[in-house]
């Protein structure tokens, strides 16, 4: 549940944060999951732990694997897993999908491209930016802090953007690159306050105890590509990830669809082996975009036994 994918290129720095959070005062121990061997904290090691961070300086392909972090508060231990994959450098310019960070959308009014994961590193400006492997030049491109701003965005600005920076650790420099796709929104499109298609507000769904059930949260946000459009489930007002019940899981990722030209997003909440206590929970479907947040609540009720009784003569 508390697992995070991280990736990097060989001979570059890679810094991974423990997926379990805590206070800065909490002790964090890191282990190789396979061997349970402790990862050293001494900075002279190529791979070392530094509080909530695990540092590969530089990374090697052989570092790939699962790492366990245990955040030790004075009274409770929280365990997380970092799934690290280190890839060989590509000889050609193509950046494979598995090395890409999340796609961002821009428009004439908003064309910020953030450099992914940069906040984990000790870097100094300026950032170098490349598009489809070509260094960006010209007054239209402005590298500002940890993001790139493109003036007067046009459709042909879409593409893969790579940021490159130097991480400094105790006087030694390590290169880091990160790539994400940038798409340009259709100016014909529009964004509006989210409309939740399902569930209906204050809906009640009948379920059978012991069976599995799925709840779909589906909302539309306007027409064309959306800069921000997200749907998610909450239980009693809490994020699913904060709810310590492994039977209840929100499916990874969100499915985008276009219905009559409208941009719609849906996500499914899967409840395995429905229990009595699940009927007491409040299930909120949340739809969020730049215009605001809309919430529809659904509750579960026990299916009336009369509905599926057999009649014997």
């Amino acid at each position: 549940k508390f697992s995070k994918q991280s990736w990097g290129l060989e001979n570059e720095a890679l810094i991974v944060r423990c997926p379990r959070q805590g206070k800065s005062s909490y002790i964090v121990d890191w282990y190789y999951s396979q061997t349970n061997k402790s990862i050293p904290t001494q900075e002279r090691n190529r791979v070392f732990a530094s509080g909530q961070l695990l540092k590969f300086l530089p990374a090697e392909v052989a570092d790939s694997g699962i790492y366990t972090c245990i955040v030790r508060s004075p009274t409770f231990n929280r365990t997380g897993y970092a799934n690290v994959t280190i890839y060989k450098k590509q000889p050609d310019c193509n950046v494979p999908d598995y090395l890409m960070y999340s796609t961002v959308s821009g428009s004439e009014k908003n064309s910020k491209i953030y450099c992914p994961t940069i906040d984990l590193y000790n870097w100094t400006a300026p950032l170098e930016w490349f598009k489809n492997c070509q260094a960006l030049q010209g007054s239209r491109y402005k590298a500002h802090k940890s993001f790139l701003v493109i003036d007067n965005v046009m459709t042909d600005d879409a593409g893969d953007y790579t940021c490159k920076f130097i991480h400094n650790e105790n006087g030694a420099n390590y290169s880091v690159t990160a790539t994400r796709s940038f798409t340009v929104k259709d100016e014909q499109g529009f964004s509006r306050f989210p409309v939740i298609r399902a569930p209906a507000h204050n809906e009640t769904k009948e379920v059978e105890i012991g069976e599995n059930t799925n709840l779909t949260c589906s909302a539309c946000f306007g027409k064309g590509a959306q800069f921000l459009a997200t749907v998610q489930w909450q239980l009693n007002g809490n994020k699913i990830t904060d709810f310590s019940e492994p039977r209840i899981q929100q499916e990874e990722g969100q499915n985008q669809s276009f219905s009559n030209g409208l941009a719609c997003v849906n996500t499914v909440l899967r409840i395995a082996d429905v229990k009595e206590e699940d009927l007491l929970l409040r299930y909120d479907c949340l739809a969020l975009n730049l215009h605001g947040l809309r919430r529809h609540t659904i509750r579960l009720s026990r299916k009336n036994p009369i509905d599926h009784q057999s009649t014997y003569c």
Partner: antibody, heavy 120, light 111 residues
Framework: QVTLKESGPGILQPSQTLSLTCSFS??????????VGWIRQPSGKGLEWLAH???????QYNPALKSRLTISKDTSSSQVFLKSASVDTADTATYYC????????????WGQGTTLTVSS | DIVLTQSPASLAVSLGQRATISCRAS??????????MQWYQQKPGQPPKLLIY???NVESGVPARFSGSGSGTDFSLNIHPVEEDDIAMYFC?????????FGGGTKLEIK
């Protein structure tokens, strides 16, 4: 600024269930490291820690009372709840909720308290 | 459970003098080189108010006449010079182990 306010039934009869609500503002219980706890104090006596709940829904209880207590939260409405089953006259006390903030684990802000009297 | 024993149970001090309250833990409250011991002040009809956290750190807004010291199992709260406004109950509290526990309290009075 940080404020916490407790609310409860005031009076209960023995064997009834106590339901307390802590409504807070000035911080979010979705912030890493944040917690909210419950403490009670019989009149003229000392303080007893009951339970607390963390940002990531980890719950911790006083083992002496664990079988009777349930703590929960509603992050979006900034509320924490405590239920105590089958109250007794010994549960008569002022109940406080308090925030666990700071770099270490301690109660840095307290509510004014709500008084519970258990009487038949 | 970690038992916290406060002494004295009550203390009468003249204005301007020093008041010292002790708190002894039944086992160490150290965590990663830090003592997880707090001190609270409680006036009648009011909730406790944090004075000192992790043994010796004075909470923001608390007058400098309050100070805390100690490590391991032995801790003390010092108030100097004592003022009229300091009349209250004082409690120590540990957060090293669950259950978090409080001392029995010390009542500070003015001579």
């Amino acid at each position: 600024q940080v404020t916490l306010k407790e609310s409860g039934p005031g009076i209960l009869q023995p064997s009834q269930t106590l339901s307390l609500t802590c409504s807070f503002s000035g911080f979010s219980l979705s912030t890493s490291g944040m917690g909210v706890g419950w403490i009670r104090q019989p009149s003229g006596k000392g303080l007893e820690w009951l339970a607390h709940i963390w940002w990531d829904d980890v719950k911790q209880y006083n083992p002496a009372l664990k079988s009777r207590l349930t703590i929960s939260k509603d992050t979006s409405s900034s509320q924490v709840f405590l239920k105590s089953a089958s109250v007794d006259t010994a549960d008569t006390a002022t109940y406080y909720c308090a925030r666990i903030g700071g770099d270490y684990d301690y109660f840095d802000f307290w509510g004014q308290g709500t008084t519970l009297t258990v009487s038949s | 459970d970690i038992v916290l024993t406060q002494s004295p149970a009550s203390l009468a001090v003249s204005l301007g003098q020093r008041a010292t309250i002790s708190c002894r833990a039944s086992e160490s409250v150290e965590y990663s080189g830090t003592s997880l011991m707090q001190w609270y002040q409680q006036k009648p009809g009011q909730p406790p108010k944090l004075l000192i956290y992790v043994a010796s750190n004075v909470e923001s807004g608390v007058p400098a006449r309050f100070s805390g010291s100690g490590s391991g199992t032995d801790f003390s709260l010092n108030i100097h010079p004592v003022e009229e406004d300091d009349i209250a109950m004082y409690f120590c509290q540990q957060s090293r182990k669950v259950p978090w526990t409080f001392g029995g309290g010390t009542k500070l009075e003015i001579k």
